[in-house]
Interface confidence: medium
């Protein structure tokens, strides 16, 4: 019969003939012959393969790099590579997260709408009216003025979105 | 100079308390976001929780959430960490530290102070 030019899915065309592809987790030792099937052997403990293939070596899974501020999100298996994330209060710099940024810090008259997470950077906000924040920080929300009414004081000076109000003694003199 | 001090360490039964101080100079503590962050034997770093300057905003990692509480008096510079119903896991050097915005993770940290939980 003729040699085959093309071949199933899941097989490859090697001398002439379809061999059976290696399954996800597993990495080719030898081809086919007309005699013999493929040859596989499961990748080792640290690495992995995640498609049907012909691949003489198995890929290593990646290293979350500590230093560079990653820790592991999902340990890899024989078919799937790890997944890594940043530290709390980092995010990934990229889809792939090949390493961390920290997450910024809001301005004065900013707050934190949302903390980082491993995959976004702080969220700020404008501190709207009633509400101020008076430092730079990744954690500090808006806090809304001192209340001088409940505390029997009066306004001495108005609040801005970056001070408090100051409050103070109510004038006896009245008319 | 920079210098944090941590305090407070020891060794303790599982379920019982301590509480870590940390004392801060030689920068704004009142304006500066603070942490905690644990080093258990044989293990690398772990973030524990941050304060923001004012100590209006607290958070947890997941593992101390509920059992831990970190605050700060400024007028003291001077950083806290609160540990009830301590457990094995719990065992580690921790470091009180500035946070710094560019990574290594912290820019200035304390020495550290050991928490053993044992029986």
């Known amino acids: 019969p003729e040699p085959p030019t093309a071949c199933r899915e899941k097989q490859y065309l090697i001398n002439s003939q379809c061999c059976s592809l290696c399954q996800p987790g597993q990495k080719l030792v030898s081809d086919c012959t007309e005699f013999t099937e493929t040859e596989c052997l499961p990748c080792g403990e640290s690495e992995f393969l995640d498609t049907w293939n012909r691949e003489t070596h198995c890929h290593q899974h990646k290293y979350c790099d500590p230093n560079l501020g990653l820790r592991v999100q999902q340990k890899g298996t024989s078919e799937t590579d790890t997944i890594c994330t940043c530290e709390e209060g980092w995010h990934c710099t990229s889809e792939a997260c090949e390493s961390c940024v920290l997450h910024r810090s809001c301005s004065p008259g900013f707050g934190v709408k949302q903390i980082a997470t491993g995959v976004s950077d702080t969220i700020c906000e404008p501190c709207p009216v009633g509400f101020f924040s008076n430092v730079s920080s990744a954690f500090e929300k808006c806090h809304p003025w001192t209340s001088c009414e409940t505390k029997d004081l009066v306004v001495q000076q108005a609040g801005t979105n970056k001070t408090d109000v100051v409050c103070g003694p109510q004038d006896r003199l009245r008319a | 100079e920079v210098q944090l001090l941590e305090s407070g360490g020891g060794l303790v039964q599982p379920g019982g308390s301590l509480r870590l101080s940390c004392a801060a100079s030689g920068f704004t503590f009142y304006a500066s976001d603070m942490k905690w962050v644990r080093q258990a034997p044989g293990k690398g770093l772990e973030w524990v929780s941050s304060?923001?300057?004012?100590?209006?905003?607290?958070y947890y990692a997941d593992s101390v959430k509920g059992r831990f509480t970190i605050s700060r008096d400024n007028s003291k510079n001077t950083l806290y960490l609160q540990m009830n119903s301590l457990r094995a896991e719990d065992t580690a050097v921790y470091y009180c530290?500035?946070?710094?915005?560019?990574?290594?993770?912290?820019?200035?940290w304390g020495q550290g102070t050991l928490v053993t939980v044992s029986s």
């Open positions: 304060i923001s300057p004012n100590g209006w905003d607290t």
């Open positions: 530290a500035k946070a710094d915005y560019t990574y290594h993770s912290f820019d200035y």
